[in-house]
Structures are given as C-alpha cells and as structure tokens.
Interface confidence: medium
C-alpha cells in the first residue's frame, strides 16, 4: 500500500536538547492507521491516528537526536481483508539538523 508522507514540523529544534516534531500522513483512503517512526532502521515511536484523521505527529523529547543515526522514516499499517495487518511502504527520509549559532 502507498507510502505515507513525512515532514519535520514547527517548532523546529535549535539544539540537540530541543524536542523534534515529525508529522506522518497516510493517503486519503487510510484514516485511523497505526504509524511507526523509525530512525536508522530502529523503531522510535508508535502512534495511532484518530479514526477520522489520516496522520499523526510524533513528538520526540530533547536528546532524541543522539539516538542511532540516520534519517527518520515512517510507515503505517491498516487492517486488510480477513483482519490481516497490511504495512505500507516506507516514507521518504526526513533529515534533522541544528542551526549553527550565529553569535
């Protein structure tokens, strides 16, 4: 099933101690899906979208950037025929970096 879209959303982090907010959204015909956020191939967080919504926002606490490296991806799962879980393709990667202080 089609990949979700993924995006870093405001407020953006300015240091590694700041929280990171990543939104993930399934296509229009998949509301209420279960979403998984990955970083460097490892599961970071799981969230379920409300039954009338197509997306979730992962709120990662400060210091999450020190977790295993690599970009973030997300994926969603829905119940298909015979109540079997179907997993989407992985989203495109999204990168997180921190602005260089301009003092």
């Amino acid at each position: 099933i089609p990949a979700p879209s993924i995006r870093l959303v405001p407020p953006y982090p300015s240091s590694q101690e700041d929280p990171i907010h990543i939104a993930c959204m399934a296509p229009g015909n998949f509301p209420g899906a279960n979403f998984t956020l990955y970083r460097g191939g490892q599961v970071v967080q799981l969230l379920q979208a409300p039954t009338d919504q197509r997306g979730v926002t992962f709120n990662l606490s400060g210091g999450s950037s020190k977790a295993p490296g690599g970009p973030f991806h997300c994926q969603y799962g829905v119940l298909g025929e015979l109540n079997q879980s179907q997993l989407s393709d992985l989203s495109e990667p999204v990168n997180v970096s921190f602005p260089v202080p301009t003092w």
């Epitope: 879209s5 993924i6 995006r7 870093l8 959303v9 405001p10 407020p11 953006y12 300015s14 907010h21 939104a23 993930c24 959204m25 296509p27 229009g28 015909n29 509301p31 919504q53 197509r54 997306g55 926002t57 999204v94 990168n95 997180v96 970096s97 921190f98 602005p99 301009t102």
Partner: antibody, heavy 120, light 110 residues
C-alpha cells in the same frame, strides 16, 4: 518588524533561466520553513515549493518539479528560487512566505512579490 | 494537484454576515485540520486570517471565524465592513509536502 523582500524578477524568454531572491529580516530566519507561492495575472494563488528551516528537506509542486530549485543561505538570511526551462505559464508574481512558529499555523508573513514575465 | 473549490464570488450588505465555502476531499480538507484562510487586496500580498481551521492570528478581528464539516471548510465574516471587500483564499495540505489553494472568492460589500 518582519520583512520579506523579493527580487530578481523580470522579462525572460521561454527556455531561459532566472533566479529569485528573498531577503528576510526581523526574525530568526534559520528557525523557519520557507515557501514560494505564485500568482498568475488575474488568477489565484499557486503553491510552488517549500524548504525546511535547515535546507535539508525540499518539496515542489508537480508543475515545477525538475525545473525549479529552492534553496536558502541562513548565513545571509536569504531564500532563493532557481527557475530553469521557463515557460509562458510560469508568468506570475512570485511571493516568498514564512511558516508560522506553531504546528501548521499557516503562512504568516509574505513578501510584496516580484513579477516574472516569460515571453518571446 | 487540483485546486480546492471555492465560489467565484460572494456578497453581503454592511453589518450582515457572509460565509465562504472551500470544498475538498477526504485526502485534503476532510483528512486533517490543516486548513488556512488568506485575505488579499488588489496588488497586495495575501494576509493570513485563519489557521488550523478556526484559529485566528493575533491582530485579526474576531469578526473572522473558520469552521469545518466533512470535506468542506468555511470562512464566516460577520458584521461586514467596507474594508472587508477583497479576495479570500483557502488552503490545505493534500499531503504533508503539497500545499493546495482554493481558486479564490471575491467578496463584495453591498
């Protein structure tokens, strides 16, 4: 106060290139996602592209994908739009706009726009 | 990337209320709350009026309000004033990286 000032527009022949700039001041430019939105004469608004606060993630409208490139220089507080292989239908006023500080809080600041005319 | 559907024009007398609709699909307006409204005067840049369906930025009069039902978002201008005469655009995300605008509605104050 927040100011976004676009420049670089003008008359250009089809197939040629142009680079637009958007100079930002009055806010911490490096902390905000930035968009380009255009408006053809007498027509509605059309989203063109967005770039993340740090420049690492970029997304484009299908109509410009592969021809336009959005970029930014946070050390100069400047947003750019490199437009290649221009077509007559790219004729429009091009606005730069900043994302809000809150989650999906809309495009809260806009420049005054710069007119790009593609004609032979 | 088809535009969201808005009426081409709307009108109302001074002091009255007028509502402008913005119809999309379950893939955009109906699938989340990321709907914004903008006001634009001729020859000027757009100005943000409403974000996340119903939130007003500071400085926007409370005469402007937003709502959503199903796949349709609405902007209501109550207590119409002459200076409200302008073009109004709705906006929504088709996916997280694809912003869409409505075709625009010209509001006339009679």
């Amino acid at each position: 106060q927040v100011q976004l000032v676009e420049s670089g527009g003008g008359l250009v022949q089809p197939g040629r290139s142009l680079r637009l700039s958007c100079a930002a001041s009055g806010f911490t430019f490096s902390s905000y996602g930035m968009h380009w939105v255009r408006q053809a004469p007498g027509k509605g608004l059309e989203w063109v592209a967005v770039i993340s606060y740090d420049g690492s993630n970029k997304y484009y409208a299908d109509s410009v994908k592969g021809r336009f490139t959005i970029s930014r220089d946070n050390s100069k507080n400047t947003l750019y739009l490199q437009m290649n292989s221009l077509r007559a239908e790219d004729t429009a006023v091009y606005y730069c706009a900043s994302e809000g500080v809150d989650f999906w809080s809309g495009l809260d600041y806009w420049g005054q726009g710069t007119l790009v005319t593609v004609s032979s | 990337q088809s535009a969201l559907t808005q009426p081409r024009s709307a009108s109302g007398s001074a002091g009255q209320s007028v509502t402008i609709s913005c119809t999309g699909t379950s893939s955009d307006v109906g699938g989340h709350n990321y709907v914004s409204w903008y006001q634009q005067f001729p020859g000027k840049a757009p100005k943000l009026l409403i974000y996340e369906v119903s939130h007003r930025p500071s400085g926007v009069p409370d005469r402007f309000s937003g709502s959503k039902s199903g796949n349709t978002a609405s902007l209501t201008v109550s207590g119409l004033q002459a200076e409200d005469e302008a073009d109004y655009y709705c906006s929504s995300y088709a996916d997280l990286n694809n912003l869409m605008f409505g075709g625009g509605t010209k509001l006339t104050v009679l």
